[in-house]
């Protein structure tokens, strides 16, 4: 009779993770008699995964019936699947020994891949925000998938982004593996409404790519525009001052006037008016009386703008010769109106 | 059913020959390694011979020579052929069937007795 | 030829009781210790073989332990139909051989 021969038919088996894996394996015959056993790996270090003559393998089951003598089917079946199951696999005839049993013979061995399915992207921005012409940096990661080969794209507003690079860790060979990707992008006035998106591809996916979001709105910072004008009034002895606040986000904004360079008065921005891009406008009012003045007056609106440096604007209200004379050294204390909104500016 | 059923067995002088036939049901017999264990009365159990799915054959020292291990494919059957017989061979005769892949004893005939006597 | 010695000959022991009887090997036989049962009159029935793997349809309350040389038999809980003759063996390499037998009466 020849010899034993271990025949291993596939050299490679891809499996879902999640799913249950087959490796094949066949005898040429039943001699010598002795176990089989299935190892993953070789040498000293290869672990043992099932045992024809002892022990408990709760995840392996024989794919055929091995209590029959004429059975030369020593195929086993994994189940649940995960990225750590991966490696070779080799199922080896061993001759009845003491105080061991003796190798006796080997199957070539069948690799086992596992398909693993990426975890959903995470993008996040930059810590602090950035005014727009700035450049800021987002970050996409994902996890755990398995093969190797993936690909990830950036979008904003749909349109595909070309300055990034992107990592795959790591660089040889593992049960899984993880992407890191960074964007760099130049963010503009109109950016509050857009988004990036991290588009990643892979063999799992079966051509339904994941997607991982951030909203622009976190990362922008879009400084006010300030107009100081005055408004025609019907009584003689008053001016209405008005500052127009524009295109600005996030909404935080605190509006200080000032009168010849004194606090007048602090108001801190509610009704705002929100702009189609996303920015908000907000108008203040001073009413000036001013016959308590006897020279002209610099009106400044001041404003600070998420925490940033103030910016302010002036004017310089003119008190006329007819307001001089009658006017009073009393100086009474500038009465503020109360904020209404100014129409959207689109 | 996995059965075997043993036969052949009877009084014998010494010197003389017996053969003894196991015939085997509910599985094919060439594909199991099969033995012969006797035992004495009022004795334990001694192991006599064997003969692998090759062909290979195998016997207990004191039978060595006198004693043949065959089988009958065709017939599914087993058989022992002693010839030379003592008074020491005198046992009950138990065909048994080798374990699938260790060569564990699973399954016993009912036995035969073999009595070697002047 | 590797010599198979069990102790003890003979055990007396009550019903529901846990008996253990033990075998040791010449030399080492890795687990290749199977374990028979027989009563007057009948042939030997297998019980346990590798050491400690039960043949179908034998009782749970029969186990089997051990390695190398030291090899046990325990019958966790005796019934009636357990009094009987008790015999290891080890199929490693032939000659096969059996120990002398335990021999479980009633008390």
């Known amino acids: 009779e020849d010899e034993l021969q271990v025949i291993q038919p596939e050299k490679s088996v891809s499996v879902a993770a999640g799913e249950s894996a087959t490796l094949r394996c066949a005898m040429t015959s039943l001699i010598p008699v002795g176990p089989i056993m299935w190892f993953r790996g070789a040498g000293a270090g290869r672990e043992l995964i099932y045992n024809q003559k002892e022990g408990h393998f709760p995840r392996v089951t024989t794919v055929s019936e091995l209590t029959k003598r004429n059975n030369l089917d020593f195929s086993i079946s994994i189940s649940n699947i995960t990225p750590a199951d991966a490696g070779t696999y080799y199922c080896v005839k061993f001759r009845k020994g003491s105080p061991d049993d003796v190798e006796f013979k080997s199957g070539a061995g069948t690799e086992l891949s596992v398909r693993a399915k990426p975890s959903a992207p995470v993008v996040s921005g930059p810590a602090v925000r950035a005014t727009p012409e700035h450049t800021v940096s987002f970050t996409c990661e994902s996890h755990g998938f398995s093969p190797r080969d993936i690909t990830l794209k950036w979008f904003k507003n749909g349109n595909e982004l070309s300055d990034f690079q992107t990592n795959v860790d790591p660089a040889g060979d593992s049960v899984s593996y993880s992407i890191h990707s960074t964007a760099r992008v130049v963010l503009t006035r109109g950016d509050v409404h857009s988004q990036v998106i991290c588009e990643i591809a892979h063999i799992t996916l079966q051509g339904d790519p994941l997607r991982g979001t951030a909203n622009l709105s976190e990362a922008i910072r879009v400084p006010p525009t300030l107009e100081v004008t005055q408004q025609p009034m019907r009584a003689e002895n008053q001016a209405n001052v008005t500052c127009q606040v524009s295109n600005f986000y996030p909404r935080g904004l605190q509006l200080t006037w000032l009168e010849n360079g004194n606090v007048s008065r602090t108001e801190t921005a509610s009704t705002l008016i929100e702009n189609k891009d996303g920015t908000y406008n907000w108008m203040s009012w001073l009413l000036v009386n001013t016959c308590a003045h006897r020279d002209d007056v610099v009106l400044t609106c001041q404003v600070e703008h998420d925490g940033q440096q103030a910016v302010s604007k002036s004017y310089a209200l003119e008190i006329s010769a007819h307001q001089k004379e009658h006017g009073s050294d009393i100086t009474h204390e500038a009465a503020l109106a109360p904020t209404a909104p100014l129409g959207g500016s689109g | 059913e996995v059965q075997l059923v043993e036969s052949g067995g009877g009084l014998v002088q010494p010197g003389g020959s017996l053969r003894l036939s196991c015939a085997a049901s509910?599985?094919?017999?060439?594909?199991?390694?099969m033995h012969w264990v006797r035992q004495a009365t009022g004795k334990g159990l001694e192991w006599v011979s064997a003969?692998?799915?090759?062909?290979?054959?195998y016997y207990t020292g004191s039978v060595k020579g006198r004693f043949t291990i065959s089988r009958e494919n065709a017939k599914n059957s087993l058989y022992l052929q002693m010839n030379s017989l003592r008074a020491g061979d005198t046992a009950v005769y138990y065909c048994?069937?080798?374990?699938?892949?260790?060569?564990?004893?699973?399954?016993w005939g009912q036995g035969t007795m073999v009595t070697v006597s002047s | 030829d590797i010599q198979m010695t069990q102790s003890p000959s003979s055990l007396s022991a009550s019903v529901g009781d846990r008996v253990t009887i033990t075998c040791r090997a010449s030399?080492?036989?890795?687990?290749?210790a199977a374990w028979f049962q027989q009563k007057p009159g009948k042939a030997p029935k297998s019980l346990i073989y590798t050491a400690s793997s039960l043949h179908s349809g034998v009782p749970s309350k029969f186990s089997g332990s051990g390695s190398g040389t030291d090899f046990t038999l325990t019958i966790s809980s005796l019934q009636p139909e357990d009094f009987a003759t008790y015999y290891c063996q080890q199929y490693v390499s032939y000659p096969y051989t059996f120990g002398q037998g335990t021999k479980l009466e009633i008390k």
């Open positions: 048994v069937r080798g374990g699938v892949w260790d060569d564990a004893f699973d399954i």
């Open positions: 030399q080492g036989i890795n687990n290749y």
């Open positions: 509910g599985f094919t017999l060439s594909s199991y390694d």
């Open positions: 003969i692998g799915t090759a062909g290979d054959t």
